[in-house]
């Protein structure tokens, strides 16, 4: 595949092994951990990225740490089971046979149970709220400039069509990006909002998943936008099923 025809690398996923063994000697890349072939013209699914992250040698994972700011995704990292298309399997279990159900972005949505736990379907996360706080600047950013820049970023860097960026809210210093995507809204080739949010989260943390591309350099009318904290909220099409004990 193209970007890397000369040196055969995957521009959208550095956690891959690539070789020119595809049809006609073309570059083909496989995700670390799973060995699954990935399409390097678009984002790799979050499930395959997490699996690759967990399979990487410990000394190569200097940047890996659970986010101290995570609100919903507070179970930290785990080695997920992915289906043949790279999506999270509805039921995830660890090595000690503790199991739980996850949503389409891999976040736990039930209490933990044993191997008898049933997760009938993979519940879709259809609304993601990315809550950012930016570092102090000389003045507030212009809201429409900020909106346009974030839509451009999500399209050009993460390939997410602007139709899925439902809104950009701004009350200095807080920026909220709302991503919305129902199953029926996704057309052929459309990026999943969960994958786009994950790439964005990693970029914001300085842990870019892109190969050879510079880190995220967000500017609004030339003024750097530097993020000092990120919270990501996930809303599922079907509400999660936690016991009252956990909620209290």
């Amino acid at each position: 595949h193209t970007a890397a025809q000369d040196n055969c690398t995957c521009p959208t996923n550095k956690m891959t092994v690539c070789s020119p063994d595809g049809p006609g000697g073309r570059c083909q890349c496989r995700a670390l951990g799973s060995g699954m072939a990935v399409d390097c013209s678009t984002l790799t699914s979050k499930c395959l990225l997490l699996k690759a992250r967990m399979s990487a040698p410990k000394n190569a994972r200097t940047l890996v740490r659970p986010s101290e700011h995570a609100l919903v995704d507070n179970d930290g990292l785990y080695d997920p089971d992915c289906d043949p298309e790279g999506r999270f399997k509805a039921r995830q279990c660890n090595q000690t046979s503790v199991c739980w159900c996850v949503n389409s972005v891999g976040v736990r949505r039930t209490d933990k149970g044993d191997l008898s736990l049933r997760c009938d379907e993979l519940v879709r996360t259809h609304h993601i709220l990315i809550d950012l706080r930016h570092r102090p600047t000389a003045g507030a950013f212009n809201h429409s400039d900020l909106d346009a820049e974030l839509r451009r970023l999500f399209r050009e860097r993460y390939r997410l069509h602007p139709k899925f960026v439902a809104a950009v809210h701004y009350e200095q210093p807080t920026i909220q990006i709302e991503l919305r995507q129902n199953t029926s809204q996704k057309a052929a080739g459309d990026v999943d909002i969960g994958d786009a949010a994950y790439y964005f989260e990693r970029d914001i943390k300085g842990e870019s998943l892109f190969q050879g591309r510079g880190g995220l350099d967000l500017r609004v009318r030339g003024e750097p936008l530097q993020v000092e904290r990120t919270l990501i909220y996930y809303l599922d099409e079907i509400p999660p099923k936690f016991s009252m004990k956990r909620l209290t």
Epitope: H1, A3, T42, N182, Q185, K186, A187, A188, G189
Partner: antibody, heavy 119, light 108 residues
Framework: QVQLVQSGAEVKKPGASVKVSCKAS????????MHWVRQAPGQGLEWMGE????????SYNQKFKGRVTITRDTSTSTAYMELSSLRSEDTAVYYC????????????WGQGTLVTVSS | DIQMTQSPSSLSASVGDRVTITCRAS??????LNWYQQKPGKAPKLLIY???RLHSGVPSRFSGSGSGTDFTLTISSLQPEDFATYFC??????????FGQGTKLEIK
């Protein structure tokens, strides 16, 4: 096989409106973007707008300043493009084309509809 | 909007020749560049998408390369049916998606 069949040629007076249809078959209509592209005689290609038939989302080329409206009827797998306030420079062949969300490549095209604007 | 510039605007070649058409974008478009072939009175046909991927049914004599702002379409050995007009198109940015002005390939 994928087919996009467009309505026939139209002759319109300046100031009038025209509505061109594009009937899709051979694939799931709601699973792909549909785009409209025009080509003036002897000229290049110009993107006009897009629709996702599943949810009726549209976006347009600002050049047309609200003159273009793209709609769809999922029951008949048909997309429509309406252009209003016609002027002579809108004389062109209008194409519908199926699009891919990531590459934004247009992999199948209708046969084209010639719209002539003349007083 | 991103401007796409093709060169040459026309060229003459013979059957069996190797032909190269170039397309330049006014800003970096990564690899989101597509090529189309159009014959007189017909709709365009997709040849290559994402810089170098051949659309189904397109002969292997067509190839594409490039990245960033500079791209090329190469026909390794011209066949009689290849005489047509070729357009490049970017799908990188927010809409509008833009095309090159076209390159007319004629028989010498």
């Amino acid at each position: 096989q994928v087919q996009l069949v467009q309505s026939g040629a139209e002759v319109k007076k300046p100031g009038a409106s025209v509505k061109v249809s594009c009937k899709a078959s051979g694939y799931t209509f709601t699973s792909y973007w549909m785009h409209w592209v025009r080509q003036a005689p002897g000229q290049g290609l110009e993107w006009m707008g897009e629709i996702t038939p599943s949810d009726n989302y549209t976006s347009y080329n600002q050049k047309f300043k609200g003159r273009v409206t793209i709609t769809r009827d999922t029951s008949t797998s048909t997309a429509y493009m309406e252009l209003s306030s016609l002027r002579s420079e809108d004389t062109a062949v209008y194409y519908c084309a199926r699009g891919h969300g990531n590459y934004v490549s247009f992999d199948y095209w209708g046969q084209g509809t010639l719209v002539t604007v003349s007083s | 909007d991103i401007q796409m510039t093709q060169s040459p605007s026309s060229l003459s070649a013979s059957v069996g020749d190797r032909v190269t058409i170039t397309c330049r974008a006014s800003q970096d478009i990564s690899n989101y560049l597509n090529w189309y072939q159009q014959k007189p009175g017909k709709a365009p046909k997709l040849l290559i998408y994402y810089t170098s991927r051949l659309h189904s049914g397109v002969p292997s004599r067509f190839s594409g390369s490039g990245s960033g702002t500079d791209f090329t379409l190469t026909i390794s050995s011209l066949q009689p049916e290849d005489f047509a007009t070729y357009f490049c198109q970017q799908g990188y940015s927010l809409p509008p998606y833009t095309f090159g002005q076209g390159t007319k390939l004629e028989i010498k």
